[in-house]
Interface confidence: low
Amino acid sequence: FERTRSLQDPCSNCPAGTFCDNNRNQICSPCPPNSFSSAGGQRTCDICRQCKGVFRTRKECSSTSNAECDCTPGFHCLGAGCSMCEQDCKQGQELTKKGCKDCCFGTFNDQKRGICRPWTNCSLDGKSVLVNGTKERDVVCGPSPADLSPGASSVTPPAPAREPGHSPQ
């Protein structure tokens, strides 16, 4: 099978880290500096990604794998393979077009990234608020008075977060 495949594509035998530099040349040449091929059978090597500016190098480029970037302190990755760096905000804030803004009342954000989310509505689950929410933390729901029987747990974890949505400005 392998021999047949090579007859159809003379370059199929070139391993990762090399390229087949001519149509019928079945000799594999190594990728030049600052380039890579992560799979076999490549006719060219790809240029290594350069982590510049707000990006910093998390993993150096090799002949068989691209460089990987992350973001400098104060920024976080967005997109596949950290294609963008977005500014961090403090907990209790979200990033808007005008910069970091505090979460509106009734919403929270417990991370340095993402948007403010509404507090959990304990009453939807027949619970009562045990601990009030803040800009940085969701409310903690407790059992309804009817549930307060001997042996019953006094605290339950917060309900799963609702679908994220932008809080009113």
Partner: antibody
Framework: QVQLVQSGSELKKPGASVKVSCKAS????????MHWVRQAPGQGLEWMGW????????TYADDFKGRFVFSLDTSVSTAYLQISSLKAEDTAVYYC?????????WGQGTLVTVSS | DIQLTQSPSFLSASVGDRVTITCKAS??????VAWYQQKPGKAPKLLIY???IRHTGVPSRFSGSGSGTEFTLTISSLQPEDFATYYC?????????FGGGTKVEIK
């Protein structure tokens, strides 16, 4: 079956030229590149270069640039090696070899002797 | 160019012996190594390609192994017809280069 048949031995004087032929059979000639290898008396194998049998484009090793020419006649499935301005140090057996992953089929070799 | 160093250069052995020839490359050549057998007055014959794959019709007593910079050709039980010179060759970069050869002689 795959066969590469080379032309016979040659005795040449210094300064002359020689043309070695390599006729292929048993496969589609233009599907595989053809490589040339030199072996001086009592010595090892030395890669000279190769020719793209589809396009006719030759590639020469550094030591074989200038006096050595690879060519083809695809109508008769034949590759050629021409050496001009022969020198005594060109005395060697010259092999053609089909290339698929490696030099998988070789001609029987052509002895070129350069002597005054 | 990539240098290939074969060892030993000469090897005396008897029929039935297990014979091992090594080939060291001056830099990483992945698995892009072939082994050839050449008898006096004859053209080389391909034995092994891609470091370990036997060419069509090559007896199973011949085997190849290795990757990176170190490769081995092993003849598990030497036969009378195996007395010859063996060459390794890399095809990882242009120009492809050959080792200096290992001559296997009858002890």
């Amino acid at each position: 079956q795959v066969q590469l048949v080379q032309s016979g031995s040659e005795l040449k004087k210094p300064g002359a030229s020689v043309k070695v032929s390599c006729k292929a059979s048993g496969y589609t000639f233009t599907d595989y590149s053809m490589h040339w290898v030199r072996q001086a008396p009592g010595q090892g194998l030395e890669w000279m270069g190769w020719i793209n049998t589809e396009t006719g484009e030759p590639t020469y090793a550094d030591d074989f640039k200038g006096r050595f020419v690879f060519s083809l006649d695809t109508s008769v499935s034949t590759a050629y090696l021409q050496i001009s301005s022969l020198k005594a140090e060109d005395t060697a057996v010259y092999y053609c070899a089909r290339y698929d992953y490696a030099m998988d089929y070789w001609g029987q070799g052509t002895l070129v002797t350069v002597s005054s | 160019d990539i240098q290939l160093t074969q060892s030993p250069s000469f090897l005396s052995a008897s029929v039935g012996d297990r014979v091992t020839i090594t080939c060291k490359a001056s830099q990483d050549v992945s698995s892009a190594v072939a082994w050839y057998q050449q008898k006096p007055g004859k053209a080389p014959k391909l034995l092994i390609y891609w470091a370990s794959i036997r060419h069509t019709g090559v007896p199973s007593r011949f085997s190849g192994s290795g990757s990176g910079t170190e490769f081995t050709l092993t003849i598990s039980s030497l036969q009378p017809e195996d007395f010859a010179t063996y060459y390794c060759q890399q095809r990882y970069t242009t120009p492809p280069t050959f080792g200096g050869g290992t001559k296997v002689e009858i002890k």
